[in-house]
């Protein structure tokens, strides 16, 4: 039993973590600067997307890059519980807080803002430089999708790294996982062509859900054959003249559920991975 | 002046390095096993490529993956001169060998076989599982291209790492370079659409040369619209029905020089990077 409530402990851990973040701003500022620079570089490379066959390639390419970049940059989240492992064990044994207070406190103060920022920055810079679909809902769906990808990738990092003493093994394991997830994301291979005994692996791929959602959000209602009334006069089975045709060829469901089921899947993955991370911290205290 | 000739010293360094390689076979065997497993996984995912629009996507995807994989796995070459830095300085000062003997000896015994093997393994496994272009020249061109990519990426790693004491900074720098090179390789962005003030960066991209050569080698003379009389029923203006159309849309020169200029560029990069690495070792000896 603890003298202080869960909420008090949560506030205290969050406050301290947030102070550490502000007290050592180099890392956070560096991350923001790197994100802004990368956003501007990507914006410059893909500036002003065309509505022709190159527009399909470039849209798919940039959405793939943003998704995989969110995943690989989330590898750094392995440090969250590893770096402070000894301090956590000492403070937990000393009765400072519950495991749950520490766990959610660190998530709220550290993981939540540091994974939210890149998504916001990338979307704000890239969206307008590229000239993606000019609707407010599409803009915010993209931002939300990138956040969800970052959170699920970070949650996976925590699930792998929680309770470990060294970062390197967890980082290597994460990188290998993301490489395979990247293959199954839907750009490097058309997911409809994979043999059934292998295709189930796509459902464990974080970037696949993110990439599918971003493509659904961006391609729906677009035309890619300039000068051709593609919806009326497309007698050619082999041309990809509309966003819907492109999505169908990629095996993406065109209904609203075809978009939102990706976020549901990512949310489920976040819950599962955070549960694993929490259980590993609980398991750790028993052996401390 | 040395009592032994350059050739004698070269033989001696090569022999010792090769003995070290054979005496500690775990690393080499592990690399071979990983390559074989990855080759089989890629072969299974892309098994039996179709000659339709998915065939274009899957061919481009697998060739991109193989190219970038060769690059990123070459990052480990940073260790070649870093790990033995102290031993090199000690032995050089003691008059055991010339810098050139050590440099070329290490390249011949270590870099040459360890970078050649993955290219051979990948090509032998992937080529037949995927059903790539069934001609002997295309098979060997693919193998040669993957080797050239591996050698140029490894040479870049040596140029960055030579003379350094720690691997981590060089590894980070290499990874960042390869991420940007990967963007400019030609899958994630159509290189014909990049603004002229930025597009010159593509000429510094190792994977761009490898990927272009592999695509030229594979796509030339392929058809992707089965059953369509393309020359008669040409409502398919927007379809990509031939490999040549695909290559043209990617901005790839269809002539034989369009293939071989990539290998020439990679060879130039290898020479430049190895020269830098050699000069850094020479420079190092002056300050030892």
């Amino acid at each position: 039993s603890y003298t202080t409530s869960f909420c008090h402990q949560l506030r205290w851990v969050s406050k301290r973590s947030f102070k550490n973040l502000l007290g050592n701003p180099q890392a956070s500022i560096a991350q923001i600067i790197v994100t802004v620079i990368l956003g501007l570089v990507i914006g410059a490379i893909y500036f002003g997307l065309n509505n022709d066959s190159t527009g399909i390639q470039n849209r798919a390419g940039v959405l793939f890059f943003l998704t995989t970049n969110q995943c690989f940059s989330s590898v750094s989240a392995v440090e969250l519980f590893v770096v402070e492992k000894k301090l956590f064990i000492h403070e937990y044994i000393s009765g400072y807080y519950r495991v749950s207070s520490y766990f959610f406190g660190k998530l709220l103060s550290d993981l939540l803002p540091m994974r939210m920022l890149p998504s916001i920055i990338f979307t704000c810079i890239v969206y307008f430089m590229l000239g993606l679909k000019p609707t407010a809902d599409a803009f915010f769906i993209m931002m939300f999708t990138l956040m969800m990808v970052a959170y699920s990738a970070s949650s996976m990092a925590l699930a792998i790294a929680a309770g470990q003493s060294v970062v390197s093994v967890a980082t290597l394991l994460m990188t290998i996982c993301f490489v395979f997830m990247m293959i199954f994301s839907g750009l490097l291979v058309n997911l409809t062509t994979i043999a059934s005994w292998l295709s189930w692996l796509q459902y464990f791929s974080i970037p696949r859900y993110g990439f599918t959602a971003l493509q659904h959000n961006e391609f729906l209602g677009q035309n890619f054959c300039p000068g051709l009334n593609a919806t009326v006069n497309n007698t050619c089975n082999y041309a990809t003249c509309t966003g819907e045709e492109y999505l169908t060829k990629q095996g993406i469901d065109l209904s609203p559920w075809g978009l939102w089921k990706n976020h549901v899947a990512l949310a489920c993955m976040i819950v599962i991975f955070l549960t694993i991370a929490y259980l590993k911290l609980l398991f750790l205290k028993k052996y401390s | 002046s040395y009592t032994t000739s350059f050739c004698h010293q070269l033989r001696w360094v090569s022999k010792r390095s090769f003995k070290n390689l054979l005496g500690n076979p775990q690393a080499s065997i592990a690399q071979i096993i990983v390559t074989v497993i990855l080759g089989l996984v890629i072969g299974a995912i892309y098994f039996g490529l179709n000659n339709d629009s998915t065939g274009i996507q899957n061919r481009a995807g697998v060739l991109f993956f193989l190219t970038t994989n060769q690059c990123f796995s070459s990052v480990s070459a940073v260790e070649l001169f870093v790990v033995e830095k102290k031993l090199f300085i000690h032995e050089y000062i003691s008059g055991y060998y010339r810098v050139s003997s050590y440099f070329f000896g290490k390249l011949l015994s270590d870099l040459l076989p360890m970078r050649m093997l993955p290219s051979i393994i990948f090509t032998c496994i992937v080529y037949f599982m995927l059903g790539l272009k069934p001609t002997a020249d295309a098979f060997f061109i693919m193998m040669f291209t993957l080797m050239m990519v591996a050698y140029s990426a490894s040479s870049m790693a040596l140029a960055i790492a030579a003379g350094q004491s720690v691997v981590s900074v060089a590894t980070l720098l290499m990874t960042i370079c390869f991420v940007f090179m990967m963007i400019f390789s030609g899958l994630l962005v159509n290189l014909t659409t990049i603004a002229s003030w930025l597009s010159w960066l593509q000429y510094f991209s190792i994977p761009r040369y490898g990927f272009t050569a592999l695509q030229h080698n594979e796509f030339l003379g392929q058809n992707f619209c089965p059953g369509l009389n393309a020359t008669v029923n040409n409502t398919c203006n927007y379809a990509t029905c031939t490999g040549e159309e695909y290559l043209t849309k990617q901005g790839i020169d269809l002539s034989p020089w369009g293939l071989w200029k990539n290998h020439v560029a990679l060879a130039c990069m290898i020479v430049i990077f190895l020269t830098i690495a050699y000069l850094k070792l020479l420079f190092l000896k002056k300050y030892s």
Epitope: - | N234, K249, L254, S255
Partner: antibody
């Protein structure tokens, strides 16, 4: 749908200048990699490639006729032109225009226009 | 150099036309069919790749300087002129082969 149509004077006198027009639709000569070529075929004889013009205005000519030929384009009107000054009877032929990629055989041809050089 | 200039065949015969270049042309060879009063039609590109719509009785092969074109089972609709084309360095047509019925 890709279509090409050649037009010319039909009959013209020796030493005059032959001007040919190729009007096309279904593609644009501003698209990366797209070119238009002129090919001719004297009656009962074989095909001879003459000249080529590409999207970025690069031009190529048959080396044996290079100093006699001039190819140009009007992208806004989807037209390509060929000029041959001081013609003689050897220039009598069916003249074809064809759409092509930068380095590719000719898949799409016009139906041809007959030019007769006669005094 | 395209040979022979003319060729007589019976229906169902196999015929072969050859083209020899003055230097290595890296398989950059195409074959055309031309019927009287019509524009040429592309049958084969890159030595052996059949264009969409080309019947499978047509085939091409070769490398370096020597290339050949075959019709395995001549039909009446195949009676036409045939041309080879090199496109490795600009474009050059062969002299043509006239295929006639015996």
């Amino acid at each position: 749908q890709v279509t090409l149509k050649e037009s010319g004077p039909g009959i013209l006198r020796p030493s005059h200048t032959l001007s040919l027009t190729c009007s096309f639709s279904g593609f644009s000569l501003t698209t990366y990699g797209i070119c238009v070529s002129w090919i001719r075929q004297p009656s009962g004889k074989g095909l001879e490639w003459l000249a080529n013009i590409c999207w970025e205005d690069s031009k190529a000519y048959n080396p044996s006729l290079k100093n006699r030929l001039t190819i140009s384009k009007d992208t806004s009107n989807n037209q390509v032109f060929l000029r041959i000054p001081s013609v003689d009877t050897a220039d009598s032929a069916i003249y074809y225009c064809a759409r092509v990629f930068n380095n590719y055989p000719f898949p799409y041809w016009g139906q041809g226009t007959l030019v007769t050089v006669s005094s | 150099t395209q040979s022979p200039p003319s060729l007589s065949a019976s229906l169902g015969d196999k015929v072969t036309i050859t083209c020899q270049a003055s230097q290595n042309i890296n398989k950059y060879v195409a074959w055309y069919q031309q019927k009287p009063g019509k524009a040429p039609r592309l049958l084969i590109r890159y030595t052996s790749t059949l264009e969409s719509g080309t019947p499978s009785r047509f085939s091409g092969s070769g490398s370096w300087r020597d290339y050949s074109f075959s019709i395995s089972n001549v039909e009446s609709e195949d009676i036409a002129d045939y041309y080879c084309l090199q496109y490795v360095n600009l474009w050059t047509f062969g002299g043509g082969t006239k295929l006639e019925l015996k």
